[in-house]
């Protein structure tokens, strides 16, 4: 969380951003809130990106003002128009690109003053893993697959019964480049699994951490997975 203030005493307002990550090819949100104004006419929102000449987005006098918008963001940005009046300056970024990563500034002017805060935006790819029993294998084998990751993640297996065990000798992980030549499909195979145990396949890079769990008993198979973005710090 980053909290920024305006410069000049009583003419400053608090602006708050949250560092976040964007999943390339999908839509992302750059989070920014500010002390609300009671009327829309005096609110100006400017999004800027370090190293980019034009604006990322500008909203003023109740509408988008995109004449100064940089070409790389053309047609890809929007504020939440109904929420500006209550202090939400967050920016929706469509079709996130790898090159969208960087430092952004959310700059606000209202009738009560000015303020700004920076936001670190990371970009990459992350997806939920799915763990299945591989019935084609000669021994009891688990297969963990996740369709899109970037940068290349690490994959670690863990087990509820053998806590702390190192499965690197009995697992094999491969990374297959997807058709767009950036993201990769992650496939990890774990051999010699035992029944009545819960196994976890953990995939992690500097943007996200995802876990796929599978519980194998004689009568059923239970699966669960979750994904967590890393480094979501407010500013």
């Amino acid at each position: 969380l980053i909290i920024g203030f305006g410069i000049s005493g009583r003419h400053s307002i608090t602006v708050t951003t949250v560092a976040s990550a964007g999943n390339i090819g999908e839509d992302g949100i750059l989070s920014c809130t500010f002390e609300p104004d009671i009327k829309l006419s005096d609110i100006v929102i400017q999004w800027l990106k370090e190293g980019v000449l034009g604006l990322v987005h500008e909203f003023k006098e109740g509408k988008d003002e995109l004449s100064e918008q940089d070409e790389m963001f053309r047609g890809r940005t929007a504020v939440f128009a109904d929420q500006v009046i209550v202090g939400n300056a967050s920016l929706r970024l469509k079709n996130v690109q790898l090159t969208d990563a960087g430092t952004y500034k959310c700059y606000i002017i209202t009738s009560k003053g000015k303020g700004n805060a920076n936001l670190e935006y990371k970009t990459g790819a992350f997806s939920m893993p799915e763990v299945n029993v591989d019935y084609n294998a000669s021994s009891e084998t688990l297969r963990c697959e996740a369709p899109r990751w970037f940068p290349q993640p690490t994959v670690v297996w863990a087990s509820q019964v053998d806590q702390g065990a190192n499965f690197s000798e009995v697992s094999n992980t491969s990374f297959e480049l997807n058709s767009e030549n950036v993201t990769m499909k992650v496939v990890s195979v774990l051999y010699n699994v035992t029944i009545n145990n819960t196994y976890s396949c953990m995939i992690e890079n500097d943007i996200a951490k995802a876990t796929g769990d599978i519980k194998v008993t004689e009568s059923e198979i239970k699966r669960r997975s979750h994904l967590q973005l890393l480094n979501s710090k407010a500013s």
């Epitope: 609300p36 009671i38 006419s41 109740g62 509408k63 128009a81 500006v84 009046i85 209550v86 009560k112």
Partner: antibody, heavy 115, light 107 residues
Framework: EVQLVQSGAEVKKPGASVKVSCKAS????????MNWVRQAPGQGLEWMGG????????EYNEKFKGRVTLTVDTSASTAYMELSSLRSEDTAVYYC????????WGQGTLVTVSS | DIVMTQSPSSLSASVGDRVTITCKAS??????VAWYQQKPGKSPKLLIS???YRYTGVPSRFSGSGSGTDFTFTISSLQPEDIATYYC?????????FGGGTKVEIK
């Protein structure tokens, strides 16, 4: 659940003052504007002003400037609207309403001005 | 002050009818218009903000459109529980101002 609970009905004489309270719960009181709106019997809605508790920023409708005073007690999450020099045409239901979208309203306080 | 002129002041329609209320601002208010519903003896309730955004929990039969000076509020299929007075409001500049209201009744 967001709730705005207003004080009870008041009967006042012309020239007197009235102070209406609005107790907020279910959200962060200091981070939203609190507006005051009145509605005379059988009439429409009229915005009187708003206050931003975190900073004490106040916006008044010029029509009421000098007669209306908006205050807050942040420790009690309560907003107040005081209207002075009352006249018969001030007879109305007075509402508090949360944030700049007026997304939640109090139940209203009837103020009757009569000699 | 920005004057919000609402019409009609009252209307009567049958259940299932499409109902349209208009609001004209005396100057450009961009899309800073909200619509409220007030049932007899009750407090107003926010239905639409920023011209067309339905507030949380508001049924999809309520919608809004417009920009600049001309705004429209529509009930696509009138229900008995929609009997109320509807108000438009601009939050573009202070003083914040409301339209005079439209009373909707069932035939």
């Amino acid at each position: 659940e967001v709730q705005l609970v207003q004080s009870g009905a008041e009967v006042k004489k012309p020239g007197a003052s009235v102070k209406v309270s609005c107790k907020a719960s279910g959200y962060t009181f200091t981070s939203s504007w609190m507006n005051w709106v009145r509605q005379a019997p059988g009439q429409g809605l009229e915005w009187m002003g708003g206050i931003y508790p975190n900073r004490g920023n106040i916006e008044y409708n010029e029509k009421f400037k000098g007669r209306v005073t908006l205050t807050v007690d942040t420790s009690a999450s309560t907003a107040y609207m005081e209207l002075s020099s009352l006249r018969s045409e001030d007879t109305a239901v007075y509402y508090c309403a949360r944030d700049s979208r007026f997304s939640y309203w109090g139940q209203g306080t009837l103020v009757t001005v009569s000699s | 002050d920005i004057v919000m002129t609402q019409s009609p002041s009252s209307l009567s329609a049958s259940v299932g009818d499409r109902v349209t209320i208009t609001c004209k601002a005396s100057q450009d208010v961009r899309t800073a218009v909200a619509w409220y519903q007030q049932k007899p003896g009750k407090s107003p309730k926010l239905l639409i903000s920023s011209t067309s955004y339905r507030y949380t929990g508001v049924p999809s039969r309520f919608s809004g459109s417009g920009s600049g000076t001309d705004f429209t509020f529509t009930i696509s299929s009138l229900q008995p529980e929609d009997i109320a007075t509807y108000y438009c409001q601009q939050h573009y500049s202070t003083p914040l101002t409301f339209g005079g209201g439209t009373k909707v009744e069932i035939k």
